[in-house]
Interface confidence: medium
């Protein structure tokens, strides 16, 4: 089958060396080519170039269109470390540092405690927080952490929420929260996250972030 | 450059007393918790006392509860621990470290710690 498909491919060869020489020999003159054949042969060889030049046009477009939906869709992503903080407030800062991401200014972090985004979409957000508490030190509720959304002319709301017991180790237990969600943001929306008691957030490296990503 | 500087190690007698100090620099020391972990010969990291950033709660290991006083002063951005009644078994290389952390350590956990402080208890 091999053998039979070069032999295929050295006719096919052949036979395109002997139109393009017919081509040559049309546009020097020669007498033993008739009139006819030569218009039919021209006409065959302008087809096949347009073809080539309008495949070549499609592909420029679709190069630019691509180019076009690139700059209408950015990606957009945001991660970020938390930050300890002298404030008394439960809202979580955070802060462009160590393994950090801010992919362009379409999404910013604002006072250190929210990331605001410009562009209206689809967004997965997420947040870990990593807290050391113990039972007898802690009030009776538990450690909770609350993904919130602030968007323009609207009230802040809940988006997700966690919530943890306090452990009964000494000094304290360590316990990670996850949160994460597919929401549709507006322009000028914010997220920022909240807790129960700021002071129990562990804020060594890889322990406490928050982030997002436009889908 | 995040700096912790344990100091006032040594040699004393059993019921002696010692005062340890660990100065930090290099990160904002008021809003952490801190805490002392200490390794003795052949060991591995024990905890022995943990107090909160604004020194208002403090906690102890059985093992040195009545007899050991930690404390901080934020002003200075200094860490202290008051050690009375030593045993020969408090001997160690004591460490500081940022304290939001539970009680089972190995090194590599601790953001902020120290190179440590030798006390050895022995008559």
């Known amino acids: 089958h091999r053998r039979l498909d070069k032999i295929e491919d050295e006719r096919n060869l052949h036979e395109d060396f002997v139109f393009m020489k017919t081509i040559q020999r049309c546009n020097t003159g020669e007498r033993s080519l008739s009139l006819l054949n030569c218009e039919e042969i021209k006409s065959q060889f302008e087809g096949f170039v347009k073809d080539i030049m309008l495949n070549k046009e499609e592909t420029k477009k679709e190069n630019s269109f691509e180019m076009q939906k690139g700059d209408q869709n950015p990606q957009i992503a945001a991660h970020v470390i938390s930050e300890a903080s002298s404030k008394t407030t439960s809202v979580l800062q955070w802060a462009e540092k160590g393994y950090y991401t801010m992919s362009n200014n379409l999404v910013t972090l604002e006072n250190g405690k929210q990331l605001t985004v410009k562009r209206q979409g689809l967004y997965y957000i997420y947040a870990q927080v990593t807290f050391c508490s113990n039972r007898e030190a802690s009030s009776q509720a538990p450690f909770i952490a609350s993904l919130c959304l602030k968007s323009p002319g609207r009230f802040e709301r809940i988006l997700l929420r966690a919530a943890n017991t306090h452990s009964s180790a000494k000094p304290c237990g360590q316990q990670s929260i996850h949160l994460g969600g597919v929401f549709e943001l507006q322009p000028g929306a914010s997220v920022f996250v909240n807790v129960t008691d700021p002071s129990q957030v562990s804020h060594g490296t890889g322990f406490t972030s928050f982030g997002l990503l436009k889908l | 450059e995040v700096q912790l500087l344990e100091s006032g190690g040594g040699l004393v007698q059993p019921g002696g007393s010692l005062r340890l100090s660990c100065a930090a620099s290099?990160?904002?020391?008021?809003?952490?918790?801190m805490m002392w972990v200490r390794q003795a010969p052949g060991k591995g990291l024990e905890w022995v006392s943990w107090?909160?950033?604004?020194?208002?709660?403090?906690y102890y290991a059985d093992s040195v509860k009545g007899r050991f006083t930690i404390s901080r002063d934020n002003s200075k951005n200094t860490l202290y621990l008051q050690m009375n009644s030593l045993r020969a078994e408090d001997t160690a290389v004591y460490y500081c470290?940022?304290?939001?952390?539970?009680?089972?350590?190995?090194?590599?956990?601790?953001?902020?710690w120290g190179q440590g402080t030798l006390v050895t208890v022995s008559s």
């Open positions: 470290a940022e304290g939001n952390y539970g009680s089972s350590y190995t090194m590599g956990v601790f953001d902020y």
């Open positions: 290099g990160f904002t020391f008021a809003f952490y918790p």
């Open positions: 107090i909160d950033a604004t020194g208002t709660r403090t």
